[in-house]
Interface confidence: low
Amino acid sequence: FEIALPRESNITVLIKLGTPTLLAKPCYIVISKRHITMLSIKSGERIVFTFSCQSPENHFVIEIQKNIDCMSGPCPFGEVQLQPSTSLLPTLNRTFIWDVKAHKSIGLELQFSIPRLRQIGPGESCPDGVTHSISGRIDATVVRIGTFCSNGTVSRIKMQEGVKMALHLPWFHPRNVSGFSIANRSSIKRLCIIESVFEGEGSATLMSANYPEGFPEDELMTWQFVVPAHLRASVSFLNFNLSNCERKEERVEYYIPGSTTNPEVFKLEDKQPGNMAGNFNLSLQGCDQDAQSPGILRLQFQVLVQHPQNESNKIYVVDLSNERAMSLTIEPRPVKQSRKFVPGCFVCLESRTCSSNLTLTSGSKHKISFLCDDLTRLWMNVEKTISCTDHRYCQRKSYSLQVPSDILHLPVELHDFSWKLLVPKDRLSLVLVPAQKLQQHTHEKPCNTSFSYLVASAIPSQDLYFGSFCPGGSIKQIQVKQNISVTLRTFAPSFQQEASRQGLTVSFIPYFKEEGVFTVTPDTKSKVYLRTPNWDRGLPSLTSVSWNISVPRDQVACLTFFKERSGVVCQTGRAFMIIQEQRTRAEEIFSLDEDVLPKPSFHHHSFWVNISNCSPTSGKQLDLLFSVTLTPRTVDLT
């Protein structure tokens, strides 16, 4: 190989061992019988050399540094050449470095031809191995602007006082052009300006200077985003740290076209703007840091650019001003994403503060809009608390558990609407009365409606789930001893059409000791399936539940249990079941941990089924499933 560097070229070539060097298989640069591991060639020198091994690329790297002095003479602006040409260099991993020194009053602009650049974070690498490392200068201190790959959005970087650009090319890469040019600009009065151009939908992740280390104290850095007017941009902060400020405040400032309040100032912990049409600027301003404990300011953020949806131009009013103790959350439904570029899906408050989830609270009127390619990606979860603190005031009081129409009119599917029903301990109990009788969801007879009510205890220490119930059954009411949550869960978009079928009234009633009482009025010719609460996990210890089953005068009820034995094994106490005729008070008692469950039995009058649990041994829980079927009395049942 021969490398000849012209005089006054201000180029230095350095060939040195890369890492890791494996010294047991030594490879040397050979110059007239001398074996050396490092070679430096300066302007005006011509050197002929070879390598002592077959694959020098596994051992050596080459650095070509060109110093460009704009202090003492004119700056050579324009397209930057790779000198010496890559074809004249040995095939080693090569780094071309351009070190440009200029006055503070001169702005320098690096312009990147297509493909533009994509910033990468610490620990990331570029797929093709080609990296651009860009640094600036503040007085004598070097500041890392960032490391970039090809195929991104960054088109220009403006700095002042000097710039150091390192282009790293792997030995096998055919690139023979620098891909950028340098232009002079007026002073930018800040650390740097990075221009990011979006041609269409896409995203860019960008970082503050020196990331992940601290942003220089009291500095200003700006990103200019060029976005087609028909697209919308949203900013989200992926990672940030705040330093300890002595004077001034760290902040981000947005210059948003059309905004009457430019610049809009945000704290880093604020929700950042979304749904911005067209170009905008974002600036990061540092502060004067505490000398004793400076901390670090750093920021990594993402800009997402996408088409606005029809919904994004509509404003929805959610009036919760008359509600109390209620919160509504719109959030992404959990799904596996497979598309390469997934447009963001945001909900915006007052059209500007957009985020992937939003919680609205009662007592106010809220204006929301959506910035989302597919609103089925979002759903709504609502929580409302109805509590009684004074038992004398609440007794016999009723509340309707209805989803407010304002919520039903939103273009987002309702997932859960939960009512937390709270009563004073040992003073009051609750009764739930549905507008339409309910069916309990079982494997044998699953619900196939668009919504169900999930009823569970709301006492933190108690793990008690009464079950899932849907309209169209035989359960007339459910009485529960103490605090519960009732969740209306939707299963299909058709809930909007079936919303009229929802309707549940809760009343506060005198306290009773049983955990739950189900009032069942079976319809003729249909089989009613009922099961004990906490199915699959077992009825909690020492819990008692009853079913009040009505039998019309002209009907006979057949009570059938679906297994021979209950399977429960008691550690302490007894588990038993009582079947009691309501008219005669005649009762049969079964020891569930010893006896065989009763064979199908026929009841001419209304009757009770009461099941009380012991303290079972783990793994031997009490789960019972039974059915009630009505048949006309005229049929001979023998």
Epitope: P20, T21, L22, L23, A24, P26, H35, S55, N58
Partner: antibody
Framework: QVQLQESGPGLVKPSETLSLTCTVS????????WSWIRQFSGKGLEWIGY???????NYNPSLKSRVTISVDTSKNQFSLKLSSVTAADSAVYYC????????????WGQGTLVTVSS | DIVMTQSPLSLPVTPGEPASISCRSS???????????LDWYLQKPGQSPQLLIY???DRASGVPDRFRGSGSGTDFTLKISRVEAEDVGIYYC?????????FGQGTKLEIK
């Protein structure tokens, strides 16, 4: 933490080919040299050869005619084949990673005993 | 091939006492880089060898500072300042200057 695991048959018949595989986990097989070393029952250690992820290799001249070391970067594995084995090739076979400076073997597998017998 | 010779072949030591193992190579292991291409390994009973010292005197990570490697050219020494019960096993030196790498025959350290 880098881990190496040898696998292969523990018994090989004389004149057949001994085949072992070393699976590297907890790190990439790229950018290091990977060696096979064996230890005879008398506790003596013998270096067999190394391979680089590009396929470049180097063998102990005493075994060169019988040994082949290959690499599969997609599986993070490298393999040893030793042909025409005799009882003298019975040993515990180790795979090891060669550290960047020195070189030295900074990570070793737990070893696999291979017996050559009919 | 470079021949490596260790002595002694067996070394009984009382816990808390120092120990010294010698390793001699048939030719100089001093590389043009200025490093000696000699490594020390310890093989504890039932285990794989583990690296103690590389480049003649550099301790591997996690190796206690009671282990010290010294020497240059053809004569090298591994010293243990205070032997502990966990130090028992066979100590090997290995040259890494030339292919093939070659090992010493091993020194068995045992507790008295």
């Amino acid at each position: 933490q880098v881990q190496l695991q040898e696998s292969g048959p523990g018994l090989v018949k004389p004149s057949e080919t001994l085949s072992l595989t070393c699976t590297v986990s907890g790190g990439s097989i790229s950018s290091y040299y990977w060696s096979w070393i064996r230890q005879f029952s008398g506790k003596g250690l013998e270096w067999i050869g190394y391979i680089y992820y590009t396929g470049r290799n180097n063998y102990n001249p005493s075994l060169k005619s019988r040994v082949t070391i290959s690499v599969d970067t997609s599986k993070n594995q490298f393999s040893l084949k030793l042909s025409s084995v005799t009882a003298a090739d019975s040993a515990v076979y180790y795979c090891a990673r060669e550290g960047g400076w020195g070189p030295h073997f900074d990570y070793w597998g737990q070893g696999t005993l291979v017996t050559v017998s009919s | 091939d470079i021949v490596m010779t260790q002595s002694p072949l067996s070394l009984p030591v009382t816990p808390g006492e120092p120990a010294s193992i010698s390793c001699r190579s048939s030719q100089s292991l001093l590389h043009s880089s200025g490093y000696n291409y000699l490594d020390w390994y310890l093989q504890k009973p039932g285990q794989s060898p583990q690296l103690l010292i590389y480049l003649g005197s550099d301790r591997a990570s996690g190796v206690p500072d009671r282990f010290r490697g010294s020497g240059s050219g053809t004569d090298f020494t591994l010293k243990i300042s205070r032997v502990e019960a966990e130090d028992v096993g066979i100590y090997y030196c290995m040259q890494a200057l030339q292919i093939p790498y070659t090992f010493g025959q091993g020194t068995k350290l045992e507790i008295k």
